[in-house]
C-alpha cells in the first residue's frame, strides 16, 4: 500500500519510490522511428493493434522524471488516409486517419515551501495533459 | 498543491476531498445506451470522432467511489466488423472492428491499519486496471 | 429480369406527404441495394436515398432531415416518404437497383419508368 | 459531395460524325486498390429512364453498341460516340458512385445537326 496524499519529506521517501512505482511498467509497444508515409503505411495481417488498423500508428515515448506518471506513449498516425481493406496497402482517400486524443490526470513534483519559506520537500500539483491514444479511420466531416 | 503520499488521517480529509478532485471532470461523451448492431452501426459525417469513426463506439461509464480515478469510461464497439467507406452506412466484412485496451494505474482506497491493528485512516493501494479506450478497424489476422 | 414500377398519388399539396412505393418483380429484393432518384421537369438527376433489404438506409444530405424510405421484403417492396413537400419537389421520381461487387455499391440499372409527382394546391 | 461537371450543356453532330462529351469530378473516383473509376455513363431519351450505357468508366453493359466509348482517369472522363445514330439522340448523364451521396453530371444534349 502507499499512503494517502499529505506532506512529503525531503529526504526522498517515499516520493521517489513512488514516482519510479507509478510508471506504466510497460509501454503499449516499443516506440519505433517511423515517419508519416513511410513503408509502414499499409495495415498488416499479424501484430499489434496498430500496425493492423487500417489508420496504422506508432508510439512515442514522453517521459518526465517529475511527472507521475513519469512515462507517456504518444500516439502518431503513419497514414493521412486510410488503408484500403481491400489490399491492406493503398490508401483510400474515402477516409482520414484521425488522432483520438484524451486530456489523462498527471501529477507534476514541485518543492513545497514551509510557512517561513523553506523547503519542505515535495508536493504534487494536479494538471490535465493531452494524450493521443491512437489513430481511428474516420469520414471525412461533411461541411454544412 | 495537494501533497506528496504518507497516511491520512480517517476523517476525510483530505482524502474525501482529494478523490473527488481527481477524477477525470467531463466524460468523453455522454454514455449511450446503443446495441451491437443498432441504427447506430453508421459512420457519421459529423460529431464526435466516435461517431465518426468506421468503427464507431459508445462510451460506458464505470464509478467506482473507492477508486481513484472514480469515474473511468470504457468503449463499447457498435459494430463486429467495419463500415464501408464508400457509404458511411453499410458494413464491410474485410474489416474487424476491436477494442483497443489500454492497463491505467488507478488507486484504491483501503483502510489503513497501524502496529496494533488499529484503524488509521485510509490508504491507497496501486493497481493496473483495463480499460477500452476506442474501437478501431483492424484487418482479420491472418493465422500462419 | 427485374423490373421495377413506381406507384403512388400523381399529386400532392405543399407541406403535405409524397408517399411512393416500388414493386420489384422477377427477383428478390434480398442482395441489394435500392435506390430512389428524382427529375425535376426540364432538369437533371438526383440521388434520394438509398434502402437495402435489412432496412439500412443512406440519405443525400440534401434531403436528410425529410426523407424516410422503407422496405418490406414480405411483399418485395420498398417506399419513399418525402414531407414538407413544396412545388420544388414537383418532378419524375425513379426506383432503381444497385448491385453491389465485392462489398462496394456500383451503378444504377435497371430504372422504373418514373412516376410524375406534382406538388400544387 | 463531389460534383460532375459536364460539358458542353448541349451538342449538334451530323450524322455519321463522332460526338464527345465531357464529364469532370470534384475529386478523384479512382479507387488505387483495384485501380477502377468509379464512373457511369447513362443515355436518357426522352420520356424514358435513364438507361445504363458504361461503367468502371470504359466498360460498355451488354447490349450496348460498340460506338460508344468511354475513357479517362481520376476526375476527367470522356464518353465517345464514333459514329452518331439517330436513335442516339438523347441527354447523356456521368454518374460517381466512389462515395455517397451518389451525384449525377447536369447532362449532355446530343442533338443531329
Known amino acids: 500500500y502507499s499512503h494517502w496524499p499529505s506532506c512529503c519529506p525531503s529526504k526522498g521517501y517515499p516520493s521517489e519510490e513512488l514516482l519510479r512505482w507509478s510508471t506504466v511498467p510497460v509501454p503499449p509497444l516499443k516506440p519505433a522511428s517511423l515517419d508519416f508515409h513511410s513503408v509502414s503505411c499499409r495495415a498488416s495481417e499479424d501484430g499489434p493493434l496498430n500496425s493492423r488498423a487500417i489508420s496504422p500508428w506508432r508510439y512515442e515515448l514522453d517521459r518526465d522524471l517529475n511527472r507521475l506518471p513519469q512515462d507517456l506513449y504518444h500516439a502518431r498516425c503513419l497514414c493521412p488516409h486510410c488503408v484500403s481493406l481491400q489490399t491492406g496497402s493503398h490508401m483510400d482517400p474515402r477516409g482520414n486517419s484521425e488522432l483520438l486524443y484524451h486530456n489523462q490526470t498527471v501529477f507534476y513534483r514541485r518543492p513545497c515551501h514551509g510557512k517561513k519559506g523553506n523547503h519542505k520537500g515535495y508536493c504534487l500539483e494536479r494538471r490535465l495533459y493531452r494524450v493521443s491514444l491512437a489513430c481511428v479511420c474516420v469520414r471525412p466531416r461533411v461541411m454544412g | 498543491y495537494s501533497h506528496w503520499p504518507s497516511c491520512c488521517p480517517s476523517k476525510g480529509y483530505p482524502s474525501e476531498e482529494l478523490l473527488r478532485w481527481s477524477t477525470v471532470p467531463v466524460p468523453p461523451l455522454k454514455p449511450a445506451s446503443l446495441d451491437f448492431h443498432s441504427v447506430s452501426c453508421r459512420a457519421s459525417e459529423d460529431g464526435p470522432l466516435n461517431s465518426r469513426a468506421i468503427s464507431p463506439w459508445r462510451y460506458e461509464l464505470d464509478r467506482d467511489l473507492n477508486r481513484l480515478p472514480q469515474d473511468l469510461y470504457h468503449a463499447r464497439c457498435l459494430c463486429p466488423h467495419c463500415v464501408s467507406l464508400q457509404t458511411g452506412s453499410h458494413m464491410d466484412p474485410r474489416g474487424n472492428s476491436e477494442l483497443l485496451y489500454h492497463n491505467q494505474t488507478v488507486f484504491y482506497r483501503r483502510p489503513c491499519h497501524g502496529k496494533k491493528g488499529n484503524h488509521k485512516g485510509y490508504c491507497l493501494e496501486r493497481r493496473l486496471y483495463r480499460v477500452s479506450l476506442a474501437c478501431v478497424c483492424v484487418r482479420p489476422r491472418v493465422m500462419g | 429480369q427485374v423490373q421495377l414500377q413506381e406507384s403512388g398519388p400523381g399529386l400532392v399539396k405543399p407541406s403535405e406527404t409524397l408517399s411512393l412505393t416500388c414493386t420489384v418483380s422477377?427477383?428478390?429484393?434480398?442482395?441489394?441495394?435500392w435506390s430512389w432518384i428524382r427529375q425535376a421537369p426540364g432538369k437533371g438527376l438526383e440521388w434520394i436515398g438509398f434502402?437495402?433489404?435489412?432496412?439500412?438506409?443512406n440519405y443525400n444530405p440534401s434531403l436528410k432531415s425529410r426523407v424516410t424510405i422503407s422496405v418490406d421484403t414480405s411483399k418485395n417492396q420498398f417506399s419513399l416518404k418525402l414531407n414538407s413537400v413544396t412545388a420544388a419537389d414537383t418532378a419524375v421520381y425513379y426506383c432503381?437497383?444497385?448491385?453491389?461487387?465485392?462489398?462496394?455499391?456500383?451503378?444504377?440499372?435497371?430504372w422504373g419508368q418514373g412516376t410524375l409527382v406534382t406538388v400544387s394546391s | 459531395d463531389i460534383v460532375m461537371t459536364q460539358s458542353p450543356a448541349s451538342l449538334a453532330v451530323s450524322l455519321g460524325e463522332r460526338a464527345t462529351i465531357n464529364c469532370k469530378s470534384s475529386?478523384?473516383?479512382?479507387?488505387?486498390?483495384?485501380?477502377?473509376?468509379?464512373l457511369a455513363w447513362y443515355q436518357q431519351k426522352p420520356g424514358q429512364p435513364p438507361n445504363l450505357l458504361i461503367y468502371w468508366s470504359s466498360t460498355r453493359d451488354s447490349g450496348v453498341p460498340d460506338r460508344f466509348s468511354g475513357s479517362g482517369s481520376g476526375a476527367d472522363f470522356t464518353l465517345t460516340i464514333s459514329s452518331l445514330q439517330a436513335e442516339d439522340v438523347a441527354v447523356y448523364y456521368c454518374?460517381?458512385?466512389?462515395?455517397?451521396?451518389?451525384?449525377f453530371g447536369q447532362g449532355t444534349k446530343v442533338e443531329i445537326k
Open positions: 434502402i437495402d433489404y435489412s432496412g439500412s438506409t
Open positions: 422477377g427477383g428478390s429484393i434480398s442482395s441489394y441495394f
Open positions: 432503381a437497383r444497385q448491385e453491389i461487387i465485392n462489398f462496394e455499391l456500383n451503378w444504377f440499372d435497371p
Open positions: 454518374q460517381q458512385y466512389f462515395s455517397t451521396p451518389w451525384t
Open positions: 475529386q478523384s473516383v479512382l479507387y488505387s486498390s483495384n485501380n477502377k473509376n468509379y
